[in-house]
């Protein structure tokens, strides 16, 4: 506990002090006081440098004195034999005696009192920046007019901070400008403009005079500009050393002016203004900016339009242009968006055709569609070449974005039919000679494939079974062969409206309009053993003349069997209708006169016993196309006959082309359109 005064006596004082003693006293007076320590008695064994016995006075780390021997007062009016004055409020006194004393020494008596110190003068370091005022137990600092005492209660400064400038234009100067600026001050000025405007500071060289830097280059007084994480300065010296125009790229600027205790100059003056924040004219490839300007600033809006073949991809949506706004931070909105080459994507596959995997699917790339030749060809033209267009579609010069359509090649057998051995005037055939041949198992009959979805046959074949099972692609109709061949499932049977339906079909004498169409559930895949026959054209070129040759095929009755195991075929000439009329009906179910002959019928055969027979019904009478000798068309359909091995009657398909086309069109699926 600090005290204002006290007494310190050597051990046993006033008796002789003992040998081998070390004793210390810690003196402490209140803060703001010094200590006056004085001795009124001193009787300690004398030795050189007081090495044996001594009293030591220590202030902090400093030894103030070391005493030994005897002393007496020089002043008859004062009992003081030795004294110490320290400006600190703590002191240590240490007494030491060695192991022997040659005489009897009485030691010492000392007193201490708290004394006032003058902080304003007693120290090397002046405690106040301006005026120092001492009082008993302390001091205080004071300032000249217009200065204020800082929180440290020692330094005076000018009240130059706290100003916030929000106007878009203004002027700021150091305190007292152009008179010398105050020493020992930190002036902070804040410029806060609306977002989207940058502070631009303008200075003239002659408007700046601040105490120069020291020999190490450090500014003693300095002016600093801070804009966000960017700093301009510190600046000092005679004439402004920095750029005369400072674009801060920020709407907020802090100006910090720091001065020390010495060397005041006239200071500085600056102007500032707010510029709309500029946004860089960015180089966005493959695009055009609208409007085009030399400089873009805050709130400017541009439309960035991609060049043809380029698009902006945002998420999954592609667009050809986007808007970008110059934002308050000097950056463009939507800056992540870029005009990329349009990607047309993996081209769609097509039925019965293919497209090679493209090296690239980007704008300008070229792909080629091909059909599965020789069984399919490209119906809608265009050559199959598509390029990736600017709108992101694969486009063909002729078809535009419409995909090519691969349709079956008709009337071309993979292997031509060659007559070999005779069988009811016919020969063994291979399905590759007649790839259009369809086998109906109930009743045992034939038909002709005319496209992927349709089979043409005789009306009398399907009148009793509207859900026929059909097969294609097999020469043999043995069960194990059919199990491996393609079975066709009917969706609907369309019998010509002119075909008369009878209660007892067995007694039929009128085979006029003996034609029907079977719509299939699924499309037929074409190949070497399955391929359609063409339909006749409507021109007079397709009118048959007597003697024109046609091919018939089927699994009908032969001389040896009721039903052929393997496909049989024959080449027959067209004959006048009267030749068929003249043949006596083998097993008549009615009067010979009752049998109807019409222009819808073709008569053929009569040569070398070649004829169709029971079980061949519905099969095509195939004639070479007059306009394309590589193709066959279905001139007729096996319909009826007076007697096997003579002449046979065939439905004249040319007369029904309109009905066939209309029926197919009206009953097509979207896939076929």
């Amino acid at each position: 506990e600090p005290t204002m005064y006290g007494e310190i006596l050597s051990p046993n004082y006033p008796q002789a002090y003992p040998s081998e003693v070390e004793k210390s006293w810690d003196i402490e007076v209140p803060e703001g006081y010094g200590i006056h320590l004085y001795f009124t008695h001193l009787d300690i064994e004398l030795s050189e440098n007081c090495a044996y016995d001594s009293v030591q006075i220590i202030s902090g780390d400093t030894e103030e004195g070391r005493l030994c021997g005897q002393r007496s007062s020089n002043n008859p009016h004062s009992p003081i034999v030795e004294e110490f004055q320290v400006p600190y409020n703590k002191l240590q006194v240490i007494f030491k005696s060695d192991f022997s004393n040659e005489e009897r020494f009485t030691g010492f008596a000392a007193y201490y009192v708290a004394t006032d110190i003058n902080e304003c003068t007693d120290f090397v370091d002046v405690p106040c920046s301006h005026f120092c005022n001492n009082f008993i137990g302390g001091y205080f600092c004071s300032c000249p007019p217009e200065y204020f005492l800082h929180d440290d209660m020692k330094n005076c400064g000018v009240n130059c901070s706290g100003d916030v400038f929000t106007a878009l234009i203004g002027e700021i100067a150091s305190p007292n400008y152009p008179k010398p600026y105050p020493e020992n001050s930190r002036c902070e000025y804040q410029i806060r403009l609306e977002k989207g405007f940058q502070v631009v500071v303008t200075l003239r060289r002659e408007d700046f005079d601040v105490e120069a830097a020291d020999s190490a280059g450090n500014c003693l007084d300095s002016l600093v500009f801070v804009a966000g994480d960017r700093q301009f300065g510190p600046y000092c010296g005679h004439g402004f050393p920095g750029p005369l125009n400072i674009e801060t790229k920020s709407n907020a600027l802090d100006i910090i002016f720091q001065t020390d205790l010495t060397g005041q100059k006239k200071g500085w003056k600056l102007r500032y203004h707010g510029d709309p924040m500029p946004c860089p004219k960015e180089d966005t490839p493959n695009s055009v900016w609208e409007p085009a300007k030399a400089k873009y600033v805050f709130r400017d809006v541009v439309q960035i339009t991609c060049l043809d073949g380029f698009e902006v991809v945002e998420g999954r949506v592609g667009a050809t242009s986007f808007y970008s706004t110059c934002q308050s931070n000097g950056k463009w909105s939507n800056s992540k968006l870029k005009c990329q080459p349009v990607d047309c994507g993996i081209p769609e596959s097509i039925e019965n055709g293919k497209v090679e995997d493209p090296e690239s699917t980007l704008f300008g790339s070229v792909i080629r569609y091909t059909c599965e030749e020789p069984y399919y060809y490209m119906e809608n033209g265009g050559g199959g070449e598509y390029h990736c267009a600017g709108n992101g579609s694969w486009v063909n010069e002729v078809l535009g974005p419409e995909l090519p359509k691969c349709v079956p090649v008709c009337g071309v057998p993979r292997e031509p039919f060659e007559e070999k051995q005779r069988i009811i005037g016919g020969s063994d055939a291979d399905i590759k000679n007649f790839p259009w041949q369809v086998f109906f198992d109930n009743p045992w009959a034939g038909g002709a494939l005319i496209n992927e979805y349709w089979v043409l046959t005789a009306a009398h074949v399907v009148e009793g079974n509207r859900e026929p099972t059909m097969y294609v692609g097999s020469t043999s109709v043995q069960t194990s062969r059919l199990a491996k061949s393609k079975m066709l499932t009917p969706e609907h049977v369309f019998i010509h409206p002119g075909w008369k339906l009878l209660e007892v079909p067995e007694g039929r004498t009128n085979f006029d309009n003996d034609i029907a169409l079977v719509r299939l559930k699924d499309p037929v895949k074409m190949g070497p053993t399955v391929s359609p026959i063409c339909l006749p054209g409507t021109s007079s070129d397709y009118n048959l003349m007597d003697g024109d040759l046609g091919l018939i095929s089927g699994w009908g009755r032969t001389e040896k069997r009721d039903r052929a195991v393997r496909l049989k075929a024959a080449r027959l000439p067209v004959a006048p209708l009267r030749k068929c009329k003249e043949v006596k009906v083998e097993k008549p179910t009615a009067d010979a006169e009752a049998y109807v002959f019409t222009p819808n019928m073709i008569c053929a055969g009569g040569e070398k016993g070649m004829d169709s027979c029971k079980g061949d019904s519905g099969g095509a009478f195939a004639v070479q196309d007059p306009n394309d000798k590589t193709k066959f068309y279905a001139a007729g359909l096996v319909s009826w006959g007076p007697q096997c091995g003579t002449y046979g009657l065939y439905t004249r398909v040319k007369n029904y082309v309109d009905w066939i086309m209309k029926t197919m069109q009206e009953n097509s699926t979207p896939r076929e359109d």
């Epitope: 198992d441 109930n442 069960t479 194990s480 069997r561 195991v565």
Partner: antibody
Framework: EVQLVQSGAEVKKPGASVKVSCKVS????????MHWVRQAPGKGLEWMGT????????IYAQKFQGRVTMTEDTSTDTAYMELSSLRSEDTAVYYC????????????WGQGTLVTVSS | DIQMTQSPSTLSASVGDRVTITCRAS??????LAWYQQKPGKAPKLLIY???SLESGVPSRFSGSGSGTEFTLTISSLQPDDFATYYC?????????FGQGTKVEIK
């Protein structure tokens, strides 16, 4: 109507071979597909193989591969089935069967030939 | 190879009874299934083909049904001539396989 007449019963020793014939009448062999089926006494029917005229190849059941040979003599309309390396479990009635048309698996069956394998 | 499982293996019934025999294929055979009747010492006789088509000359009391893997032969009213062994056969591939047979005997 097709008729199939098979050769008579045979008794063979283990390890020997047997050749069963099947004569076609009422049709030509070239028009037909001939299959061979066997039936062990008191057991079920077991398909052995066939000649496929479309492919011109003979197809054998896995079980008999390497032991059976099926041949045809079209000049006499006779089919043959030869089974070698006979074992007692080959004792069975062997049938020749013509394949049917359009869904019918079989058309005509021979009367059967009993082959007995016994030492 | 496709396995054919026939059940029951033996069936005791009386004249006039309705009899059902089932056949299961180890994989789908569509409708490529036939039923045969065999009497001792005779070759099998085709009754039903295409799972449900009646062979000509076979009495209408025999009927077949099913497709894929499950098939049934039904004799609507058992006659004295019907006591025999019945086999199912798949012919969807060249490797024909038969069921093990169902013997229909007099109760």
């Amino acid at each position: 109507e097709v008729q199939l007449v098979q050769s008579g019963a045979e008794v063979k020793k283990p390890g020997a071979s047997v050749k069963v014939s099947c004569k076609v009448s009422g049709d030509t062999l070239t028009e037909l597909s001939m299959h061979w089926v066997r039936q062990a006494p008191g057991k079920g029917l077991e398909w052995m193989g066939t000649f496929d005229p479309e492919e011109g190849e003979t197809i054998y059941a896995q079980k008999f591969q390497g032991r059976v040979t099926m041949t045809e003599d079209t000049s006499t309309d006779t089919a043959y089935m030869e089974l070698s390396s006979l074992r007692s479990e080959d004792t069975a009635v062997y049938y020749c069967v013509t394949e049917g048309l359009a869904w019918r698996p079989t058309d005509s069956w021979g009367q059967g030939t009993l082959v007995t394998v016994s030492s | 190879d496709i396995q054919m499982t026939q059940s029951p293996s033996t069936l005791s019934a009386s004249v006039g009874d309705r009899v059902t025999i089932t056949c299961r294929a180890s994989q789908s055979i569509s409708s490529w299934l036939a039923w045969y009747q065999q009497k001792p010492g005779k070759a099998p006789k085709l009754l039903i083909y295409k799972a449900s088509s009646l062979e000509s000359g076979v009495p209408s009391r025999f009927s077949g049904s099913g497709s894929g893997t499950e098939f049934t032969l039904t004799i609507s009213s058992l006659q004295p001539d019907d006591f025999a062994t019945y086999y199912c056969q798949q012919y969807s591939s060249y490797a024909w396989t038969f069921g093990q047979g169902t013997k229909v005997e007099i109760k």
